[in-house]
């Protein structure tokens, strides 16, 4: 099919670059003839260092090709992304980042974990890819619910907490108010809506401290709020239904033995919060002496019968409703309770299956007489709000 054009010279035979091939292969290439270069799998077309998706050259009248020959260069995925709170190891060889090289991501042991196995391979598209086909690096998620606390300790009727007992405990300080919260991720705090309602439009004025036992300790980790999310069903000053809020922190905090999120309840957790099951609440609120606690105090308290609690409060404060979004805890005989200044703190339970602590309740409201007989503490029932919590966290 070759037609030698007048006054035109044939072009030099194109030589396929290493790891590449040329098509079509012809005995001679003359004016307007063309060839394309294709690279083997794991190699890419580069013109200098610039990637090309395809390459076709055309023979010109003067007997030269209109484009310089590219190369087929081995795919290089480049240095893998850094992993916050983790590290990457080169498996194939030191700093080897080319096609089929393998790397292994790992999280800092004890305090962080990843959902995948962390193994990534440099694939032909030039991206580090996991066995599940993920192109983004894994995430080191904070471990939740690890504590040195054990149930059985005999706030009001409480005992001082030891280091590592309640690493999720957060102190919320306003100009004139103090409340608590629970770390549920490395940049999210769960608390009671009523405790932060006044700050909702001025989040930055809320001072958040964590990693402390002594309320006035100078050795705290400071966190600043970015935004406060009050549950849309909460009406300030009209009862305590939906008394739940989330605080997004400006920065992620580093997780360690004294700062760690509490777990959120699994679906199966409802069975661990039945009447008479024991939970633990900690706080710097009023103690039996009527003074704010200097040291973080905790108390182990049983879940109260919901109907009995509802009846008590109907009698005590007519018009104040104990809703299905609340759970009550305390002894019929009194003596163990949370109190003013504990608001927003977590009522936690040990999940026997996972051996992790999860938040079942948020300190919400109760009788003016903390720890009085037959007058239970009322807590926001967190399990009812898991979809709300997950929705806020995933969207913001």
């Amino acid at each position: 099919h070759h037609h030698h054009h007048h006054a035109s010279r044939p072009c030099p035979d194109p030589t396929a670059p290493p790891n590449g091939s040329i098509s079509p292969v012809q005995a001679i290439y003359v004016l307007k003839d063309r060839f394309s270069v294709f690279c083997k799998t794991g190699f890419e077309l580069l013109q200098g260092s610039v990637p090309l998706k395809s390459f076709t050259a055309v023979c010109q009248k003067d007997g030269s090709w209109d484009r310089p020959m590219p190369e087929c260069s081995i795919i290089d995925c480049g240095p893998p992304d850094d992993l916050p709170n983790g590290h990457v190891d080169y498996i194939t060889g030191p700093e080897v980042t080319t096609y089929k090289a393998v790397i292994q991501y790992s999280c800092e042991e004890t305090f962080y974990t990843m959902s995948s196995n962390g193994k990534y391979v440099c694939e032909a598209d030039g991206f580090w890819t996991s066995s599940k086909g993920e192109k983004l690096p894994p995430v080191c998620e904070p471990v939740c619910g690890l504590s040195t606390h054990t149930i059985g300790g005999r706030i009001v009727g409480g005992q001082p907490a030891k280091p590592g007992d309640f690493p999720w405990q957060v102190l919320l300080l306003g100009q004139t108010t103090a409340a608590a919260g629970a770390l549920i991720h490395d940049n999210w705090v769960l608390t009671a809506a009523h405790a932060v309602y006044e700050k909702r439009m001025a989040a930055s004025s809320l001072n958040i401290r964590m990693g402390i036992l002594k309320r006035l300790s100078p050795h705290y980790t400071q966190a600043w709020p970015e935004e406060i999310f009050i549950h849309e069903g909460y009406t300030h000053g009209a009862g305590f239904d939906n008394d739940i809020a989330l605080i997004k922190l400006k920065n992620k905090v580093t997780i360690n033995g004294s700062i760690m999120p509490v777990c959120l309840p699994r679906k199966e957790a409802a069975s661990l919060m039945r009447t008479d099951f024991t939970g633990t609440v900690a706080g710097w609120g009023l103690t039996q002496k009527g003074l704010l606690a200097r040291n973080l105090m905790f108390v182990d308290i049983p879940i109260a019968d919901h109907q009995k609690c509802t009846a008590v409060y109907e009698k005590l404060y007519p018009g104040v409703r104990v809703s299905a979004n609340m759970l009550c805890a305390g002894l019929e005989t009194g003596g163990k309770d949370s109190c003013r200044g504990d608001a927003g703190g977590a009522l936690v339970f040990l999940d026997n299956e996972t051996q992790r602590w999860f938040v079942g309740g948020i300190v919400s409201w109760g009788s003016i007489n903390c720890g009085a007989a037959d007058q239970y503490g009322v807590y926001t029932k967190v399990i009812n709000y898991i979809p709300w919590i997950e929705n806020i966290i995933s969207n913001f």
Epitope: Q47, V50, K53, R67, P68, M69, P70, E71, G78, D125
Partner: antibody, heavy 117, light 112 residues
Framework: EVQLQESGPGLVKPSQSLSLACTVT?????????WHWIRQFPGNKLEWMGF???????NYNPPLTSRISITRDTSKNQFFLQLNSVTTEDTATYYC??????????WGQGTLVTVSA | NVLMTQTPLSLPVSLGDQASISCRSS???????????LEWYMQKPGQSPKLLIY???RRFSGVPDRFSGSGSGTDFTLKISRVEAEDLGVYYC?????????FGAGTKLELK
């Protein structure tokens, strides 16, 4: 014919991030080639900053690696430059460009970015 | 980094003259694939640079044939056979063989 147009704020405060967009018309940024950012300092010195390829892979000028990110939005046929922790030394005219068998065959008209308190 | 040194920094010419700009690189620009990625760009005041020549001697589309490029290894030249008014501006050589790629400081072509 392919056309490129830079856009973004003309004034950035020191220590903040500089963010620019390059809108491409007449050619899809996923079809082929590499898409570059280049800057020209007062005094006319030119510096290549980095590129994003048709496949989305990036290559940066080593001194800028810790501060630069080039990303894209294929649905809008745009690619972006983000330069963090800027100083007055980052004051320049920023250009986007496209390569072929050469590095910069097609250029945008450039946008001046001043870094000043 | 490869240093690109242009001479002269300023080149006064008369219209119709031949102009020659030299560019020297601090190391060979022959790429491992055998090509030499040396390019020339021209910039007029208030405009973006425009590509004139690539891989030493190939003219970019639409570039008049009065522009020619030559050289090898570390020494390269851009010639304009007959300077026209529209050719006045700043000329930059550029190397794309070694990353990071680098530009020369520029040569200003101006009227005598």
């Amino acid at each position: 014919e392919v056309q490129l147009q830079e856009s973004g704020p003309g004034l950035v405060k020191p220590s903040q991030s500089l963010s620019l967009a390059c809108t491409v018309t007449g050619y899809s940024i996923t079809s082929d080639y590499a898409w570059h950012w280049i800057r020209q300092f007062p005094g006319n010195k030119l510096e290549w900053m980095g590129f994003i390829s048709y496949s989305g892979r990036t290559n940066y000028n080593p001194p800028l690696t810790s501060r630069i990110s080039i990303t894209r939005d294929t649905s809008k046929n745009q690619f972006f430059l983000q330069l963090n922790s800027v100083t007055t030394e980052d004051t320049a005219t920023y250009y986007c460009a496209r390569s072929y068998d050469y590095w910069f065959g097609y250029w945008g008209q450039g946008t001046l970015v001043t870094v000043s308190a | 980094n490869v240093l690109m040194t242009q001479t002269p920094l300023s080149l006064p010419v008369s219209l119709g003259d031949q102009a020659s700009i030299s560019c020297r690189s601090s190391q060979s620009l022959v790429h491992s694939n055998g090509n030499t990625y040396l390019e020339w760009y021209m910039q007029k005041p208030g405009q973006s640079p425009k590509l004139l020549i690539y891989t030493v001697s190939r003219r970019f589309s639409g570039v008049p044939d009065r522009f020619s490029g030559s050289g090898s290894g570390t020494d390269f030249t851009l010639k304009i056979s007959r300077v026209e008014a529209e050719d006045l501006g700043v000329y930059y050589c550029f190397q794309g063989s070694h990353v990071p790629v680098t530009f020369g400081a520029g040569t200003k072509l101006e009227l005598k």
